[in-house]
């Protein structure tokens, strides 16, 4: 017989030879990191037809790492179903808890023993330090020193000393989230007031108000014979400016050569003013949104 078969889990005892006589026996032992469990044979014989009698390494089992229990408030998940060396053990924590330590342990061979690559991690309760205090405002539960996962606080602004109120810019409610951090940055309390939006040759049609504070929304339409250059809807933003900017009402001209009358409003002007009907969504000059205002 030629050289005997080789296996993943067991190796030949002694040195292999190039040829073996009929009837000659070779013995195997489990490789390092494997251990033998009877009754399967671990030897073979050179048969008279010059082949080796059937033999397998199925009696050699991989060394196994010790069983690890689920961490408290968490779970240990075997990536490939067994504790044999080469295995990966993944750890996750329940909602509201975070991992201290390594989230993956590997079953490794040290000499002939299978051991885990580190200590199992712990699952600790997610806690947040108090959220930031803000100028001109406050938050609920200001006396609490430690917040648990999903605990929420709500911010509100103080009464303003002047005629204009403080507006709350940002999220009014934030909660203690993953990584022991708050879900959003603390909001800001400040006076946000946009200037009165003046549109020459047009008028405001909605969003009327004494003053225009944060998030106030205003809509416009142009007079007959004028079309809107810009957005018909503007919003007062946190920097006290309108976004998009206050639009302009430009005169509709019938030919590209017609020069539009000089207007005091600053800003770029198209040289050709298309007819109003070319602007879908905007009222034609004779179709005021609020006809009673015309």
């Amino acid at each position: 017989c030629e050289a005997p078969p080789t296996f993943e889990a067991m190796e030949l005892i002694g040195k292999p030879k190039p040829y073996y006589r009929v009837g000659e026996r070779v013995d195997y032992k489990c490789k390092k990191g494997y251990f033998y469990i009877p009754p399967l044979a671990t030897h073979t014989i050179c048969d008279r037809n010059h082949t080796w009698l059937p033999v397998s390494d199925e009696g050699c089992y991989r060394e196994m790492c010790p069983h690890i229990r689920d961490p408290l408030n968490g779970e240990a998940i075997l990536a490939n179903g067994s504790y044999e060396f080469g295995a990966e053990l993944h750890f996750i924590c329940n909602e509201g808890y975070y991992l201290i330590g390594k989230d993956i342990l590997y079953c490794e061979l040290k000499d002939t023993v299978a051991i885990w690559s580190g200590k199992p991690p712990l699952c600790e309760k997610i806690l947040c330090t108090p959220p930031p205090k803000i100028k001109n405002g406050k938050h609920t539960f200001s006396e609490v020193e430690v917040f648990e996962y999903l605990d929420a606080v709500t911010y509100s602004c103080d009464p303003a000393p002047g005629p204009d109120p403080f507006s709350l810019i940002g999220e009014s409610m934030i909660y203690c989230g993953n990584n022991s951090t708050w879900s959003h940055a603390a909001p800001e309390c400040k006076v946000v007031k946009c200037r009165f939006p003046v549109v020459e040759n047009g008028k405001q049609i909605s969003g009327f108000g004494k003053k225009f504070y944060y998030k106030a929304t205003v809509m416009f339409e142009c007079d007959k014979g004028y079309y809107l250059n810009g957005s018909d809807k503007i919003v007062c933003e946190s920097n006290s400016t309108w976004d998009p900017p206050v639009p302009k009402c430009l005169k509709v001209s019938t030919s590209p050569t017609t020069k539009s009358p000089t207007s005091s409003a600053s800003g770029p002007r198209p040289t050709y003013k298309p007819p109003v009907s070319n602007y879908p969504g905007y009222p034609k000059p004779d179709e005021g949104i609020l006809n009673n205002l015309d």
């Epitope: 200037r195 009165f196 409003a265």
Partner: antibody, heavy 118, light 107 residues
């Protein structure tokens, strides 16, 4: 407290240009929106125009072709120029501060009478 | 332009009276209306803005109401210093326009 003071010639000849200034004391012109308003003798008030802090202007279309409102920050003054005047432009001219960007006139100058006559 | 019509153009009243002045706009102006008081030889003074908001320093006997096209200025109990001319002013649309005025005289 901000004070406004109009000044300029009390008499202007027809077809000439009326020029008035509004001096601001107790504040900077760059932070005020100013309107000019006039009142013919024994009559009501008529809005002429406004200049905003960003330098933009809006004018009453009745004066559009002959009015200019401007600001001189170095002198802390606003000015009104009205060209081609006629006797109908005889009036007390006021400068008034637009309140905080809103079109109500909270602070007024004492007014200056301009007579258009040859 | 939006025309502002005040009525009456003049009225006589006595100290202690309740007085109402009306202002009508030629088209809807929401609440974009101000009231001014002017005494002879003086500049106007802002009394009320945005229909009903009292300007600082203005006595509470002055009040304003209305919406759309019809507005009123009410003086609940006339005082001697209230005899003057009163003007309304709209600001929904350029040009901003004033009413013709209402002269309030001592009866």
């Amino acid at each position: 407290q901000v004070q406004l003071q109009e000044s300029g010639p009390g008499l202007v000849k027809p077809s000439e240009t009326l020029s008035l200034t509004c001096t601001v004391s107790g504040g900077s012109v760059s932070s005020y929106d100013i309107s000019w308003i006039r009142q013919p003798p024994g009559k009501g008030l008529e809005w002429i125009g406004v200049i905003w802090t960003d330098g933009g202007t809006n004018y009453n279309s009745a004066f559009m072709s002959r009015v200019t409102i401007s600001v001189d920050t170095s002198k802390n003054q606003f000015s009104l120029k009205l060209s081609s005047v006629t006797a109908a432009d005889t009036a007390v001219y006021y400068c008034a501060r637009v309140y905080d960007g809103y079109p109500w006139f909270a602070y007024w100058g004492q007014g200056t009478l301009v007579t258009v006559s040859s | 332009d939006i025309q502002m019509t005040q009525s009456p153009s003049s009225l006589s009243a006595s100290v202690g009276d309740r007085v109402t002045i009306t202002c009508r706009a030629s088209q809807g102006i929401s609440n974009y209306l101000n009231w001014y008081q002017q005494k002879p030889g003086k500049a106007p003074k802002l009394l009320i803005y945005y229909t009903s908001s009292l300007h600082s320093g203005v006595p509470s006997r002055f009040s304003g109401s209305g919406s759309g096209t019809d507005f009123t200025l009410t003086i609940s109990s006339l005082q001697p210093e209230d005899f003057a001319t009163y003007y309304c002013q709209q600001y929904i649309k350029l040009p901003w326009t004033f009413g013709g005025g209402t002269k309030l005289e001592i009866k």
